[in-house]
């Protein structure tokens, strides 16, 4: 694994091929999670930010930007969308958490919580995922769509199997995240596929 501190994945072009696979040995279904990362893109169309599919299950966990100021979370093919006033184009720190017991999903954009939404109460997110950055999966690790591809930069990605309290979300935003036990930017197992380049993070 690699310590990617101070670095980003650059997706320099629109494509149906360029992506990064994130590898995790996640064995147990997820009852809770928090996912945080930084992104910078000048796309105004919709695109996938984080695509997590399991065998036979599309959109098991998907973070998707519908348009400027609108972020969606899919859990088990169900969707909620939260809105925020944001500058465009501008770097953004995104966190999203979901708790099975309540179904509550919450986005945090640049350290600010958006309106909480609810979906899939009681559901467990399947384990043994294929996780893809740069493309939206329509199958287990494949079937990409150019019109949903990400063009830009992604970094500082961490994923925990718990709902982090606000102070920990803020510490991730400020650059001092807790050790993460699903995906950790400081110890990341990944595979680059296609035209994706690792470069220094210069926009925080």
């Amino acid at each position: 694994h690699t310590d990617l501190s101070g670095k980003v994945f650059v997706f320099p072009r629109e494509s149906v091929t360029d992506h990064v696979n994130l590898i995790t040995p996640l064995e147990k279904p997820l009852q809770n999670f928090t996912l945080c990362f930084r992104a910078y893109s000048d796309l105004s169309r919709a695109y996938s930010l984080f695509s997590y599919n399991t065998q036979g299950r599309d959109n098991e966990l998907l973070v998707y930007k519908e348009r400027v100021g609108e972020y969606s979370l899919y859990i088990g093919r169900h969707k909620v969308t939260s809105k925020v006033i944001e500058k465009f184009p501008a770097p953004v720190h995104i966190c999203v958490s979901w708790e099975s017991s309540s179904g509550i999903a919450e986005f945090w954009i640049n350290g600010t919580p958006l309106v909480k939404k609810g979906l899939r109460q009681g559901y467990f997110v399947e384990a043994q995922p294929k996780i893809v950055l740069g493309q939206e999966q329509d199958s287990y690790g494949g079937k990409f769509d150019r019109s949903q591809s990400f063009v830009g930069e992604i970094g500082d990605l961490y994923m925990w199997d718990s709902v982090l309290p606000p102070e920990n979300i803020l510490s991730a935003y400020q650059g001092t995240p807790l050790p993460a036990n699903i995906l950790d930017w400081q110890a990341l197992n990944y595979e680059i596929r296609g035209y994706v380049i690792i470069k220094p993070l210069v926009w925080v």
Partner: antibody
Framework: QVQLQQPGAELIKPGASVKLSCKAS????????MHWVKQRPGQGLEWIGM????????NYNEKFKSKATLTVDKSSSTAYMQLNSLTSEDSAVYYC????????????WGTGTLVTVSS | DIVMTQSQKFMSTSVGDRVSVTCKAS??????VAWYQQKPGQSPKALIY???YRYSGVPDRFTGSGSGTDFTLTITNVQSEDLAEYFC?????????FGSGTKLEIK
């Protein structure tokens, strides 16, 4: 097999410094975080800090920030910890330990170095 | 810092018995707890990670359980080679912290 080899013992005078070594073998040294842990008799284990040999990124326990300095030599697959201004409180066994591939626990521990601070 | 409390400093058991070593965290650490075994004069060895997953090569008589603040390492069918000190460790927050250890004595 994966091994972390450390010198058995160091005898140091109070006020002096010591540089402890941890030679890794049997795996790709630059791919795993290396941690250092202190063990004083009857006082359990204390986490000192960690270093990633490739990025040379470090993270210290606040308590040891002014006491310990972590470095690596990639060419010899060796991690180092320098301890400065030694006192009797620093007399302990010091272990290096490798972080697991995916999880934040230590799957391989070094043999340990006993540091004795005495005049 | 998170304090990991192992209230039993010593535990006495017999070969073939079942023994449970407990560890309590001062705040929620989710499932981010590991257990280590340290035999006299040796380095610690990993037994359990993520509260309940056995490290490769560890006999299945060692079982970890718990989440949140309360964790247990259970050894069933205790063997003489299990004579050791057992430490819990949280890896949920920096700095990582360890319990003070529980020494298992074989009668």
């Amino acid at each position: 097999q994966v091994q972390l080899q450390q010198p058995g013992a160091e005898l140091i005078k109070p006020g002096a410094s010591v540089k402890l070594s941890c030679k890794a073998s049997g795996y790709t040294f630059t791919s795993y975080w290396m941690h250092w842990v202190k063990q004083r008799p009857g006082q359990g284990l204390e986490w000192i800090g960690m270093i990633h040999p490739n990025s040379v990124n470090t993270n210290y326990n606040e308590k040891f920030k002014s006491k310990a300095t972590l470095t690596v030599d990639k060419s010899s697959s060796t991690a180092y910890m320098q301890l400065n201004s030694l006192t009797s409180e620093d007399s302990a066994v010091y272990y290096c330990a490798r972080r697991n591939d995916y999880y934040w626990y230590f799957d391989v521990w070094g043999t340990g170095t006993l540091v004795t601070v005495s005049s | 810092d998170i304090v990991m409390t192992q209230s039993q400093k010593f535990m006495s058991t017999s070969v073939g018995d079942r023994v449970s070593v407990t560890c309590k965290a001062s705040q929620n650490v989710n499932s981010n707890v590991a257990w280590y075994q340290q035999k006299p004069g040796q380095s610690p060895k990993a037994l359990i990670y993520s509260a309940s997953y056995r490290y490769s090569g560890v006999p299945d008589r060692f079982t970890g359980s718990g989440s949140g603040t309360d964790f247990t390492l259970t050894i069933t069918n205790v063997q003489s080679e299990d004579l050791a000190e057992y430490f819990c460790q949280q890896c949920n927050n920096y700095p990582f912290t360890f319990g003070s250890g529980t020494k298992l004595e074989i009668k």
